[in-house]
Interface confidence: low
Amino acid sequence: AESCTSRPHITVVEGEPFYLKHCSCSLAHEIETTTKSWYKSSGSQEHVELNPRSSSRIALHDCVLEFWPVELNDTGSYFFQMKNYTQKWKLNVIRRNKHSCFTERQVTSKIVEVKKFFQITCENSYYQTLVNSTSLYKNCKKLLLENNKNPTIKKNAEFEDQGYYSCVHFLHHNGKLFNITKTFNITIVEDRSNIVPVLLGPKLNHVAVELGKNVRLNCSALLNEEDVIYWMFGEENGSDPNIHEEKEMRIMTPEGKWHASKVLRIENIGESNLNVLYNCTVASTGGTDTKSFILVRKADMADIPGHVFTR
């Protein structure tokens, strides 16, 4: 089954089919009997309920809101509501680049070392059954590959492989032809030696908080492309519904390494969140490095020397 749409901020290109899938979809038995509502709000309009009559381009299924296709005026906030479950997304629909086969702002960059294994597979599991054919383009020139359902490149990388690779899926829906484009900017680089990853800032951080408020703990590291950064907390990671690990952000440094940042968001801080360790770890092939955060009630700040506090 296709995963749900967990990212709260989404950018998508106008004119393409698009869908939002809420994350309580696994509760299949509840779904059938419970009232479910999708809402949109944008600018002056506050929480307008969506239904198939809202637009001929919108289709509603149990778990999914589909756009056939998504257009610029679909930009806004979307909400799914079922019993006491709510999920929200902010959708930004951007203009298609009419002079290219892809839109620059919707490109995924990937760095591959020369002579290392290089793979591109064109796949789209959600629309799989509707896809008639798929083409793979390099710098907007069609590549002639055997498989026109899931075109694939698998090889050891050479410098000539550098470029923009666009997977274009062609599909029919209600008698109309649509296409979905996914583009990868592949950069081929010389063999690079690894650094020992390092977490930035002090190893132990006391964070002054107020009960009922929210806090964002930011963990930053300098690391190699394949290193991982993750949060660990509590007995079972992720058992607290008020704790959310945000999407990792990465920026490449001029030396070809990565500056990574991962935020742990704790909402509606309770007593159970105080005086426990929230550990951020960076793990590489050479081992791990960890830094810890402890939430302390503002009233108790006087007990701790000022220099150990972070904001």
Epitope: S3, T108, K110, K115, K116, F117, Q119, I120, T121, E123, S125, N156, F184, E225, E226, V228, I229, Y230, K247, E248, R250, W258, A260
Partner: nanobody, 115 residues
Framework: EVQLVESGGGLVQAGGSLRLSCVAS????????IRWYRQAPGKQREWIAS???????NYADSVKGRFTISRGDARNIGYLQMNSLKPEDTAVYYC?????????WGQGTQVTVSS
């Protein structure tokens, strides 16, 4: 999205062997390295082995010479062959992959080594 499922854990006597599998399903474009970690009760999750997209391998000192990491021909499956197991190898074993710099973890498989 990538989903990971580990299997092959269980109860084994010291000196015995187990082979763990990690299968990545879903969208597996640019799942480059497969890594294994383990977490013993009350301890930090620790890295134990990696295999990169070009099949070069790396091991933590604690398992070097006893554990072997490999990947299947389909490239979306990783293995951890564990020989000469010791009681201190008891832990939940997790596999991890990265796709476009998002980390994906499996649910883990329990390995218990009795003396």
């Amino acid at each position: 999205e990538v989903q990971l499922v580990e299997s092959g854990g269980g109860l084994v006597q010291a000196g015995g062997s187990l082979r763990l599998s990690c299968v990545a399903s879903g969208s597996t474009f640019s799942v480059n390295a497969i890594r294994w970690y383990r977490q013993a009760p009350g301890k930090q999750r620790e890295w134990i082995a990696s295999i990169t997209d070009s099949s070069s391998t790396n091991y933590a000192d604690s398992v070097k010479g006893r554990f072997t990491i490999s990947r299947g021909d389909a490239r979306n499956i990783g293995y951890l062959q564990m020989n000469s197991l010791k009681p201190e190898d008891t832990a939940v074993y997790y596999c991890n992959v990265m796709k476009n710099w998002d980390n994906y973890w499996g649910q883990g498989t329990q390995v218990t080594v009795s003396s």
